[in-house]
């Protein structure tokens, strides 16, 4: 689940089994000139960044929950 910083896709691989408990924020990057795929990068409670699989049902649920909590704040 390493995260690269160059101007290309940042997610080299994604983590399986992610749990929402330690997720502080989620950044959804839409496809663009530097990366043809959607990327989901979570920032964990300890500051570590983790790439998530945007196609995973649980990740979709986590993103939806985070976006809803952002709207209500």
């Amino acid at each position: 689940a390493s995260v690269a910083t160059e101007l290309r896709c940042q997610c080299l691989q994604t983590l399986q089994g992610i749990h929402p408990k330690n997720i502080q924020s989620v950044n959804v990057k839409s496809p663009g000139p530097h990366c043809a795929q959607t990327e989901v990068i979570a920032t964990l409670k300890n500051g570590r960044k983790a790439c998530l699989n945007p196609a995973s049902p649980i990740v979709k649920k986590i993103i939806e929950k985070m976006l809803n909590s952002d709207k209500s704040n």
Epitope: L15, G17, I18, N22, L44, K45, N46, I58
Partner: antibody
Framework: QVQLQQSGAELVRPGSSVKISCKAS????????MNWVKQRPGQGLEWIGQ????????NYSGKFKGKGTLTADKSSSTAYMQLNSLTSEDSAVYFC????????????WGQGTSVTVSS | DIQMTQSPSSLSASLGGKVTITCKAS??????IAWFQHKPGKGPRLVIH???ILQPGIPSRFSGVGSGRDYSFSIRNLEPEDIATYYC?????????FGGGTKLEIK
């Protein structure tokens, strides 16, 4: 490599308190939740609670609230569990277990600390 | 709190055989179930998390499946070192809760 070293066995009197420790090494202690689990003789595992050493955030099972306190000392990478007003029901082996950051699986466990409450 | 009902509480199987343990949650746990192997005098060992993901170093003889409220854990080609008590753990919602355990013995 990750290691969790727990303190030795305790024989304590009913009504007294005990504080057991779990010294972590091989990882960034402050960055991972530490869980505590109880096993009474001949019984199964029971989750007690957890502490996040980085900010001292805690979560407890309802059954354990009021029975004790979880603390952590970042300078020595040691987690503690204090149990108060001990009764025979508290006689058990207590385990500490690190919780992985992204998937919260308890991937590393201490060897256990036996607490015997007897007069 | 979520209750985890684990069965059977004990089972006996032959070397080389297969065993299956089940856990039923009192509500949907979104695949957040782990399975642990526990031997006397040692700390429990994580075998599987998130229903089916094998912990590194665990042989592929171990497997897990399930969704919603119903989950199972299997060991095939049983070996002597598999003798232990196995526990399921739900970690969908705090407080985390364990199943009652299954003591595995070899015939």
């Amino acid at each position: 490599q990750v290691q969790l070293q727990q303190s030795g066995a305790e024989l304590v009197r009913p009504g007294s308190s005990v504080k057991i420790s779990c010294k972590a090494s091989g990882y960034a202690f402050s960055d991972y939740w530490m869980n505590w689990v109880k096993q009474r003789p001949g019984q199964g595992l029971e989750w007690i609670g957890q502490i996040y050493p980085g900010d001292a955030d805690t979560n407890y099972s309802g059954k354990f609230k009021g029975k004790g306190t979880l603390t952590a000392d970042k300078s020595s990478s040691t987690a503690y569990m204090q149990l108060n007003s001990l009764t025979s029901e508290d006689s058990a082996v207590y385990f500490c277990a690190r919780e992985r950051d992204y998937d919260v699986a308890m991937d590393y466990w201490g060897q256990g600390t036996s607490v015997t409450v007897s007069s | 709190d979520i209750q985890m009902t684990q069965s059977p509480s004990s089972l006996s199987a032959s070397l080389g055989g297969k065993v299956t343990i089940t856990c039923k949650a009192s509500q949907d746990i979104n695949k957040y179930i782990a399975w642990f192997q526990h031997k006397p005098g040692k700390g429990p060992r994580l075998v599987i998390h998130y229903t089916s993901i094998l912990q590194p170093g665990i042989p592929s003889r171990f497997s897990g499946v399930g969704s919603g409220r119903d989950y199972s854990f299997s060991i095939r080609n049983l070996e002597p070192e598999d003798i232990a008590t196995y526990y399921c753990l739900q970690y969908d919602n705090l407080p985390w809760t364990f199943g009652g355990g299954t003591k595995l013995e070899i015939k």
